[in-house]
């Protein structure tokens, strides 16, 4: 069936080694277990993470993000799913795209990142 | 079971304070962008203010912006709303509402807390 | 901020009528909207969210359509828990601006 994949339509905040969330979900909801599920970057197309046959594929992934995020699946079962990157880094910044595949269907939604300084003050006057 | 339990309300003078919590249990607290939502007695529903799920971003509507702070305490499971400078306006029950990675909808509700401005 | 404007503001109705209310956006929120459902001294409902999908658990007789600046709710056979108060409201903005509530009433 079809579907369509939402993300959120504002750039998500995070401080410099941090962790960070990017959800995205299907619209209508329904059970996602046994679809693809992953972000790449654009504009190459680079694995950030993968999860397919109800696992995560860490061989696919970019070397940049191997050890350093999780899919949080809790709400899989109603098409809603989490990426948490941890220990962000600058080159994290800028865009990512989620997707679903469901056989050879397939639907995605574009999100962005900025990371920021911590320890950057800009000090007033 | 999902339950969101609201608390703090009661009656404040005009320019006072009140601290309300949103007690949460039942899912994954972190994983939920989280907003008060108010309704003035036999008035429509009235966004106030949201949260993202790890507290680093705050939005609030105009009525309230300078005045109301919300915040999050995830290790907690509760959302908090600070509001000072109240005004006979501000008189509403007060509900915390659940948004699944802030774009979704409100699918839970608390059941309100009634907050009186008045002298 | 994105205004939502709900007519009918009160609907007279019985049950197994057809019932329709409609929303509008003051500007395009493709199809950032759900519509809620309230009884006197109870928390809202979600019923419908993007505009057209049923959240789990709500009754089929409840439908959803429309995209940009014009929604509908449609309750197909009104049934005697439907009489409610329902507000649509907007989500494609931080500002989650609700509609003023239709109360849909006996006749």
């Known amino acids: 069936g079809q579907f369509r994949v939402i993300g959120p339509r504002h750039p998500i905040r995070a401080l410099v080694g941090d962790e960070v969330e990017l959800p995205c979900r299907i619209s209508p909801g329904k059970n996602a277990t046994g679809m693809e599920v992953g972000w790449y970057r654009p504009p190459f197309s680079r694995v950030v993470h993968l999860y397919r046959n109800g696992k995560d594929q860490d061989g696919d992934q970019a070397p940049e993000y191997r050890g350093r995020t999780e899919l949080l699946k809790d709400a899989i079962g109603e098409g809603k799913v989490t990426l948490r990157i941890r220990n962000v880094r600058f080159s994290d910044e800028g865009g990512f795209t989620c997707f679903f595949r469901d056989h050879s269907y397939q639907e995605e939604a574009a999100m962005e990142l900025k990371v920021e300084d911590p320890f950057y003050w800009v000090s007033p006057g | 079971e999902v339950q969101l339990l609201e608390s703090g309300g009661g009656l404040v003078q005009p320019g006072g304070s009140l601290r309300l919590s949103c007690a949460a249990s039942?899912?994954?607290?972190?994983?939920?962008?989280m907003s008060w939502v108010r309704q003035a007695p036999g008035k429509g529903l009235e966004w106030v203010s949201a949260i993202s799920g790890s507290g680093g971003s705050t939005y609030y509507a105009d009525s309230v912006k300078g005045r109301f702070t919300i915040s999050r305490d995830n290790s907690k499971n509760t959302l908090y709303l600070q509001m000072n400078s109240l005004r006979a306006e501000d008189t509403a029950v007060y509900y915390c509402?659940?948004?699944?990675?802030?774009?979704?909808?409100?699918?839970?509700w608390g059941q309100g807390t009634l907050v009186t401005v008045s002298s | 901020d994105i205004q939502m404007t709900q007519s009918p503001s009160t609907l007279s109705a019985s049950v197994g009528d057809r019932v329709t209310i409609t929303c509008r956006a003051s500007q395009s929120i493709s199809s950032w909207l759900a519509w809620y459902q309230q009884k006197p001294g109870k928390a809202p409902k979600l019923l419908i969210y993007?505009?057209?999908s049923l959240e789990s658990g709500v009754p089929s007789r409840f439908s959803g359509s429309g995209s940009g600046t014009e929604f509908t709710l449609t309750i197909s056979s009104l049934q005697p828990d439907d009489f409610a108060t329902y507000y649509c409201q907007q989500k494609d903005t931080w500002s989650y601006t609700f509609g003023q509530g239709t109360k849909v009433e006996i006749k």
């Open positions: 993007d505009a057209s």
């Open positions: 509402a659940r948004d699944w990675g802030g774009i979704y909808y409100f699918d839970y």
């Open positions: 039942g899912f994954t607290f972190s994983s939920y962008a």
